[in-house]
């Protein structure tokens, strides 16, 4: 779950479940800071604009962001 | 199967230290928050630590917070509690609790059976 | 701190009949942050409801959750034998702590 604070990682569990890209929202990549020393990566549904935090080590995940990011791709000009 | 066993209650006199601990089995424990709730003697249920997936993360209530410290070995699949400068009020069963990670929040999905702490001179 | 007041603090109903548990906060809880526990004596709590109206895995669909803001509501549509227990609602919001209300203990007329 992620929990919303100033400081600090965001999320508390992370989870390995693939998403399917078409019930996203929307994919929120945190980058490493010096709150939190690593990548977090948010994934709001469509249903309830339900939140979850996804693992970024997870292959489901990896190929989730290759196909979010393949889809931006053929969106841009 | 997904279970989680707490050891190391016990009878200990006001003032005094004890370690709590919590085993994970059946699951990723490495990918889940971890919750400590507490039960007083015929009372309700009460909140007490977390600690996030990475154990970067702590919170408190904050009727234990500076005496006691929520902690994870993820290569040991444990939780701990590590309870100092105990009072009598601190008396009560201790259950250890998995924060649900399929969502944004989920609820305490799995419990331990507890493990019973008595602060008693 | 957000503060969670369960009513009644006692229902005394019998088996087949249809039981209404009241939760209410001190300020408005999203509803993704609100969950349901039922306690059998001796035994450690179980997650019923989550998200205010999602049932957990494995909950019987006689238990449903509603409700939004600051009231919220747990009801079981028919009383079994088994369902006699207490009930606690827990509120989870932005920031710790994720405080529980004191309990409805459901018993037999």
């Known amino acids: 779950i992620p929990l919303s604070r100033t400081v600090r990682c965001t999320c508390i569990s992370i989870s390995n479940q693939p998403v399917n890209p078409r019930s996203l929202e929307k994919l929120e990549i945190i980058p490493p800071s010096q709150f939190c020393p690593h990548v977090e990566i948010i994934a709001t549904m469509k249903k309830k604009g339900e939140k979850r935090c996804l693992n970024p080590e997870s292959k489901a995940i990896k190929n989730l962001l290759k196909a979010v990011s393949k889809e931006r791709s053929k969106r841009s000009p | 199967q997904v279970q989680l066993v707490e050891s190391g209650g016990g009878v200990v006199q006001p003032g005094r230290s004890l370690r709590l601990s919590c085993a994970a089995s059946g699951f990723t424990f490495s990918n889940c928050g971890m919750h400590w709730v507490r039960q007083a003697p015929g009372k309700g249920l009460e909140w007490v630590a977390l600690i996030g997936y990475d154990g970067i993360n702590e919170y408190y209530a904050d009727s234990v917070k500076g005496r006691f410290t929520i902690s994870r070995d993820n290569s040991k699949n444990t939780l701990y509690l590590q309870m100092n400068s105990l009072r009598a009020e601190d008396t009560a069963v201790f259950y250890c609790?998995?924060?649900?990670?399929?969502?944004?929040?989920?609820?305490?999905?799995?419990w331990g059976q507890g493990t019973t702490v008595t602060v008693s001179s | 701190e957000i503060v969670l007041t369960q009513s009644p603090g006692t229902l005394s109903l019998s088996p087949g009949e249809r039981a209404t548990l009241s939760c209410r906060a001190s300020q408005s809880v999203s509803s993704s942050y609100l969950a349901w526990y039922q306690q059998k004596p001796g035994q450690a709590p179980r997650l019923l409801i989550y998200g205010a109206s999602s049932r957990a895995t494995g909950i019987p669909d006689r238990f449903s959750g509603s409700g939004s803001g600051t009231d919220f509501t747990l009801t079981i549509s028919r009383l079994e034998p088994e369902d006699f227990a207490v009930y606690y609602c827990q509120q989870y919001g932005s920031s710790p702590p994720f405080t529980f209300g004191p309990g409805t203990k459901v018993d037999i007329k």
């Open positions: 609790a998995r924060d649900w990670p399929e969502g944004y929040y989920n609820g305490m999905d799995v």
